[in-house]
C-alpha cells in the first residue's frame, strides 16, 4: 500500500503565439481545481475508462477575477498535494490523466457551473520511494507544470511497496534470513504473517492476512485437496495426465475473504462481500457494534448494541454495501432531469442541460408557461423545454405582441384580392368564384357549388371572413 502524490506548480498560457483568454472575468469570477486519474500499465485507454489505480480531486483554488486588458497570467492554484492512495502493489508503470476544471462563481441560475479547461495525459515508469519527478504538459494553448512521486505507507517498502519492514528487535542485526530494509537500514524486512491457520505446507501469502493455495489445494486455509490423492504434492501432476482439477491463479483462489465473505474478481484484484458484522478488505474485522461506527459515508447504524447482535447500516442516497462503503454509480440514477447529460466528477455530479433547462439537475424549465403572459388574448402552449403562444386572430410574434398582417399568407384563393379589416380579412373574389376565401367555383348556369351564397350576396361580392 502507498500513496501517489501530485503537486501542481503552475497552470497558465504556454509559450508561443495565441495566448488563451483568461478563463475568468470581472462579470464571471472563477476558481480552478484539478482532478487526477491513474490507471495501471502503459496501455492507451479511453479517458472515460475507470481510474483503476485511483483518482483524486484538489481543493478549490482562490477566486480569481481577470484584470481588464491584462494577458492571462498563471492562475492561482489550490493549496496542497493531490493524493491518490493505492491499496495493492505499485505497478511501476502507469498512465495518468490530469484535468483542470474551472468553477464559475457568477450569479447565474443553477449556481456554480463547472467546465473542463484542459486535459493532459501521459504514460510513465516510476518506482515507489524515488524522488519527485518533474513534468510539463501542454493542452492547446495552456501549459501545466507539475511533479509527482509514489511513496509506500509503512510498513511497506520497496519499488513496488510489497516488502514489509519492522523496527529491529536487536540493535545490531536482523533475524535469521531477514535482510535490512534499504533505505531504512535501522529496520528489517518483516516475515509475512499469513492468515491464522493457513496451511504452512499448501498455502502461502503475498500480503499479510491472506492465504493463497498451491495447485491442488483449496479452502480458506488451503487444507482441502481439490481432487484425488494423486494431486496432493505441492506441485502436483498436471491435470492433463491425471484428470485432476487444478485451479487457475485467479485473485479469488483460496478465497481471501474471511468470516464467510464471498469473493468476486475485479479487473485488478478481488473484492469481498462481507456478511453482517464483518467488514474490511478481507472481512477480517469482526465483533463490531454501532459504537464502533461501522457505517461509512454518513450511513445510519441500527441495532448491534453488543458484539453478538448484528448491526445494519442504512445508507444515504448515493452509497451502498453492507457498510455503505461503495459509492453508487451516480449517473446510473439518471439524476439529470429533462434530457440533461450526466457527468460524475468524483467530488460532485454535474449536469449539462438541454436548451430551455437549467439548475444543478436541469430541474428548472426556463421556457415553461409559468409567469409568462401571451398578449392580446393569446394562450400559452407548453412543451418539453419550449413554450409558444397561440395567438388570437390578427396578432402574431413570440408573445402575440405584434399586429399580424392577415393578408400575408395570401388566404384568398383563385386570384381573389385580400383586404385587411379590423375583425380579420376580406376577400374580393375573381369572377367565377365565391366564398369567404373564394374557394367555391360558381357554376356557369348561375347555381353555385355548396355552400350556397347567403341571400342578397352576389357572386364576386367581397365577403368578409370573420
Amino acid at each position: 500500500a502507498g500513496v501517489f502524490e501530485l503537486q501542481i506548480h503552475s497552470f497558465g498560457p504556454g509559450p508561443g503565439p495565441g495566448a488563451p483568454r483568461s478563463p475568468c472575468s470581472a462579470r464571471l469570477p472563477c476558481r480552478l481545481f484539478f482532478r487526477v486519474c491513474l490507471k495501471p500499465g502503459l496501455s492507451e485507454e479511453a479517458a472515460e475508462s475507470p481510474c483503476a489505480l485511483g483518482a483524486a480531486l484538489s481543493a478549490r483554488g482562490p477566486v480569481y477575477t481577470e484584470q481588464p486588458g491584462a494577458p492571462a497570467p498563471d492562475l492561482p492554484l489550490p493549496d496542497g498535494l493531490l493524493q491518490v492512495p493505492f491499496r495493492d502493489a505499485w505497478p511501476g508503470t502507469f498512465s495518468f490523466i490530469i484535468e483542470t476544471w474551472r468553477e464559475e462563481l457568477g450569479d447565474q441560475i443553477g449556481g456554480p457551473a463547472w467546465s473542463l479547461l484542459a486535459r493532459v495525459a501521459g504514460r510513465r515508469r516510476l518506482a515507489a520511494g524515488g524522488p519527485w519527478a518533474r513534468d510539463i504538459q501542454r493542452a492547446g494553448a495552456w501549459e501545466l507544470r507539475f511533479s509527482y512521486r509514489a511513496r509506500c505507507e509503512p510498513p511497506a517498502v520497496g519499488t513496488a511497496c510489497t516488502r514489509l519492514c519492522r523496527p529491529r528487535s536487536a540493535p545490531s542485526r536482523c533475524g535469521p534470513g531477514l535482510r535490512p530494509c534499504a533505505p531504512l537500514e535501522d529496520e528489517c524486512e518483516a516475515p509475512l504473517v499469513c492468515r491464522a491457520g493457513c496451511s504452512p505446507e499448501h498455502g502461502f501469502c503475498e500480503q499479510p492476512g491472506e492465504c493463497r493455495c498451491l495447485e491442488g489445494w483449496t479452502g480458506p486455509l488451503c487444507t482441502v485437496p481439490v481432487s484425488t490423492s494423486s494431486c496432493l504434492s505441492p506441485r502436483g501432476p498436471s491435470s492433463a495426465t491425471t484428470g485432476c482439477l487444478v485451479p487457475g491463479p485467479g485473485p479469488c483462489d483460496g478465497n481471501p475473504c474471511a468470516n464467510g465473505g464471498s469473493c468476486s474478481e475485479t479487473p485488478r484484484s478481488f473484492e469481498c462481500t462481507c456478511p453482517r458484522g464483518f467488514y474490511g478488505l478481507r472481512c477480517e474485522v469482526s465483533g463490531v457494534t454501532c459504537a464502533d461506527g461501522p457505517c461509512f459515508n454518513g450511513g445510519l447504524c441500527v441495532g448491534g448494541a453488543d458484539p453478538d447482535s448484528a448491526y445494519i447500516c442504512h445508507c444515504p442516497p448515493g452509497f451502498q454495501g453492507s457498510n455503505c462503503e461503495k459509492r453508487v454509480d451516480r449517473c446510473s440514477l439518471q439524476p439529470c432531469r429533462n434530457g440533461g447529460l450526466c457527468l460524475d466528477l468524483g467530488h460532485a455530479l454535474r449536469c449539462r442541460c438541454r436548451a430551455g433547462f437549467a439548475g444543478p439537475r436541469c430541474e428548472h424549465d426556463l421556457d415553461d408557461c409559468a409567469g409568462r403572459a401571451c398578449a392580446n388574448g393569446g394562450t400559452c402552449v407548453e412543451g418539453g423545454g419550449a413554450h409558444r403562444c397561440s395567438c388570437a386572430l390578427g396578432f402574431g410574434g413570440r408573445d402575440c405582441r405584434e399586429r399580424a398582417d392577415p393578408c400575408a399568407a395570401r388566404p384568398c384563393a383563385h386570384g381573389g384580392r385580400c383586404y385587411a379589416h379590423f375583425s380579420g380579412l376580406v376577400c374580393a373574389c375573381a369572377p367565377g368564384y365565391m366564398g369567404a376565401r373564394c374557394e367555391f367555383p360558381v357554376h356557369p348556369d348561375g347555381a353555385s357549388a355548396l355552400p350556397a351564397a347567403p341571400p342578397g350576396l352576389r357572386p364576386g361580392d367581397p365577403q368578409r371572413y370573420l
Epitope: 456554480p112 454518513g298 448515493g318 451516480r330 429533462n338 439548475g359 439537475r361 424549465d365
Partner: antibody, heavy 121, light 107 residues
Framework: EVQLVESGGGLVQPGGSLRLSCAAS????????MHWVRQAPGKGLEWVAY????????YYADTVKGRFTISRDNAKNSLYLQMNSLRAEDTAVYYC??????????????WGQGTTVTVSS | DIQMTQSPSSLSASVGDRVTITCRAS??????LNWYQQKPGGAVKLLIY???RLHSGVPSRFSGSGSGTDYTLTISSLQPEDFATYYC?????????FGGGTKVEIK
C-alpha cells in the same frame, strides 16, 4: 441524529415582515441543500423555497417569488426565510427540511417540527 | 407546473389490511417521486424516495412502484402507527409539488 429546529414564527399584520430561522445539527450542514415547506391550516403541504448547499442557487414557489428570500449561514449551521409583504394566505406552519445529499432526488429527507406564522389584522 | 393528483383523498382500513395509495402526475416525472408520512402531531417523515427506495429506518412493509405519470405507495400490512396522512411529491421539475394528501383512518 439529524435535528432541525425552526423559530421566529408569530402573529403579523398584512404587509408586515417576519424572519424564520432553522438551527441544524447532527449532520454536515454545508453538504446539503435545504428547503422551506409550509402547510396552511387544514390543507396539504406546499413547497416554498430551496437553497443549495453552498448558497449559490435558490428557487422559490411562484406564490412567494419577490416577497420571500431564503438564505443560509454555513458557519452557524443555520437556514433563514425572510418574509416580506405578508398576506393572509401566507398563514401556515412553516417547516424547514433537509435536501438529499447532492440533490440527486430532490427529496426532503428530514423535517423540523415547524413554526406557526399567522398573518391577520 | 406539474400537478400531482392523489387518490383516494381518505380511506378507512383495519390493522393488518393491505393499503394502496396512488399518485398521478400531469406529465412524466421520470421516477423522481417521493412519499412522506405526516402524523397528526405535525411531524413529517420521508418514507420512500425515487419511486421505490426505502429511506433509512422505514419498515419494509412500505413499498413504492410506478413510472412515467403513475405511482403507487403500498402498505402491505397496516400497523397502528401507520394511521396518518400520506403525501407524494415530484422532484423532477421546478416548482416541487405535492399531492393533496391521503388520510388513512381506522375503520
Amino acid at each position: 441524529e439529524v435535528q432541525l429546529v425552526e423559530s421566529g414564527g408569530g402573529l403579523v399584520q398584512p404587509g408586515g415582515s417576519l424572519r424564520l430561522s432553522c438551527a441544524a445539527s447532527g449532520f454536515t450542514f454545508s453538504d446539503y441543500g435545504m428547503h422551506w415547506v409550509r402547510q396552511a391550516p387544514g390543507k396539504g403541504l406546499e413547497w416554498v423555497a430551496y437553497i443549495s448547499s453552498g448558497g449559490y442557487t435558490s428557487y422559490y414557489a411562484d406564490t412567494v417569488k419577490g416577497r420571500f428570500t431564503i438564505s443560509r449561514d454555513n458557519a452557524k449551521n443555520s437556514l433563514y426565510l425572510q418574509m416580506n409583504s405578508l398576506r393572509a394566505e401566507d398563514t401556515a406552519v412553516y417547516y424547514c427540511a433537509r435536501g438529499d445529499y447532492e440533490d440527486i432526488f430532490y427529496t426532503m429527507d428530514y423535517w423540523g417540527q415547524g413554526t406557526t406564522v399567522t398573518v391577520s389584522s | 407546473d406539474i400537478q400531482m393528483t392523489q387518490s383516494p383523498s381518505s380511506l378507512s382500513a383495519s390493522v393488518g389490511d393491505r393499503v394502496t395509495i396512488t399518485c398521478r402526475a400531469s406529465r412524466d416525472i421520470t421516477k423522481f417521486l417521493n412519499w412522506y408520512q405526516q402524523k397528526p402531531g405535525g411531524a413529517v417523515k420521508l418514507l420512500i424516495y425515487y419511486t421505490s427506495r426505502l429511506h433509512s429506518g422505514v419498515p419494509s412493509r412500505f413499498s413504492g412502484s410506478g413510472s412515467g405519470t403513475d405511482y403507487t405507495l403500498t402498505i402491505s400490512s397496516l400497523q397502528p402507527e401507520d394511521f396518518a396522512t400520506y403525501y407524494c411529491q415530484q422532484g423532477n421539475t421546478l416548482p416541487w409539488t405535492f399531492g393533496g394528501g391521503t388520510k388513512v383512518e381506522i375503520k
